[in-house]
């Protein structure tokens, strides 16, 4: 898994500081209060965030 600050998580994933790894945004349906879900909600759907995080 990528460390924070080195590269973003792949599309559809978001960094979890609690778990110290990238997590699937799809799991926010089941675990909406997880820390990484904030990153999923805020991230634009287009892949531009890979260029301008």
């Amino acid at each position: 898994e990528q460390a924070p600050g080195t590269a973003p998580c792949s599309r559809g994933r978001s960094w979890s500081a609690d778990l110290d790894k990238c997590m699937d945004c799809a799991s926010c349906r089941a675990r909406p209060h997880s820390d990484f879900c904030l990153g999923c909600a805020a991230a634009p759907p287009a892949p531009f965030r890979l260029l301008w995080p």
Partner: antibody, heavy 119, light 111 residues
Framework: EVKLEESGGGLVQPGGSMKLSCVAS????????MSWVRQSPEKGLEWLAE??????????HYAESVKGKFTISRDDSKSRLYLQMNNLRAENTGIYYC??????????WGQGTTLTVSS | DIVLTQSPASLTVSLGQRATISCRAS??????????MQWYQQRPGQPPKLLIK???NLDSGVPARFSGSGSGTDFTLNIHPVEEEDAATYYC?????????FGGGTKLEIK
């Protein structure tokens, strides 16, 4: 290293009861949804029961086939998962797997414990 | 309950070739963003092992020769190139709703 170890299987007569246990190590047990999954030649893999987290008030869900007969529980202080099974019948025979998942999938599996219901 | 139908029930693939396994759900298991379908591998005498979650996302440590695709009701697991250690039974599983259900399995043999 993640480890799930089931125990409590064996031979039981129809109508009898059995309690399965599973001890977990190598991951943050209290942050994982836990389930029991059964495997038999007749029905393949069957999800039986799930228990969620303390923050979910330990919400439980059951397959219709075991509702009212099986009870899932957990002890986070001991990293243990349980399945109390009552009024057992031949169709409950199979390998019982303890499984854990961060969400709605099964990340981790034990090696399974075999339950045989027969007279 | 959602019924998952896998096909074929068994297949034999030559070493280095592609194996394709299908899973059809009796109703959609997808939103506009995500699909709630997993794939597992079970080798003889072993418990199942998670390969892919949410239709396309490889679990950590799973080789890149495994890939998943599909949405709605039709999903596919591809293995390419197939290796000897891939001989196993593969299962799909949905997490759209309770109860979670599994497909009947596809047994992959390597020649």
């Amino acid at each position: 290293e993640v480890k799930l170890e089931e125990s409590g299987g064996g031979l039981v007569q129809p109508g009898g009861s059995m309690k399965l246990s599973c001890v977990a190590s190598g991951f943050t047990f209290n942050n994982y949804w836990m389930s029991w999954v059964r495997q038999s030649p007749e029905k393949g893999l069957e999800w039986l029961a799930e228990i969620r987290l303390k923050s979910d008030n330990y919400a439980t869900h059951y397959a219709e086939s075991v509702k009212g007969k099986f009870t899932i529980s957990r002890d986070d202080s001991k990293s243990r998962l349980y399945l109390q099974m009552n009024n057992l019948r031949a169709e409950n025979t199979g390998i019982y797997y303890c499984t854990g998942g961060f969400a709605d999938y099964f990340d981790y599996w034990g090696q399974g414990t075999t339950l045989t219901v027969s007279s | 309950d959602i019924v998952l139908t896998q096909s074929p029930a068994s297949l034999t693939v030559s070493l280095g070739q592609r194996a394709t396994i299908s899973c059809r759900a009796s109703q959609s298991v997808s939103t506009s963003s995500y699909s709630y379908m997993q794939w597992y591998q079970q080798r003889p005498g072993q418990p199942p092992k998670l390969l892919i979650k949410y239709a396309t996302n490889l679990d950590s440590g799973v080789p890149a020769r495994f890939s998943g695709s599909g949405s709605g009701t039709d999903f596919t697991l591809n293995i390419h190139p197939v290796e000897e250690e891939d001989a196993a039974t593969y299962y799909c599983q949905h997490s759209w709703e309770i109860p979670y259900t599994f497909g009947g399995g596809t047994k992959l043999e390597i020649k």
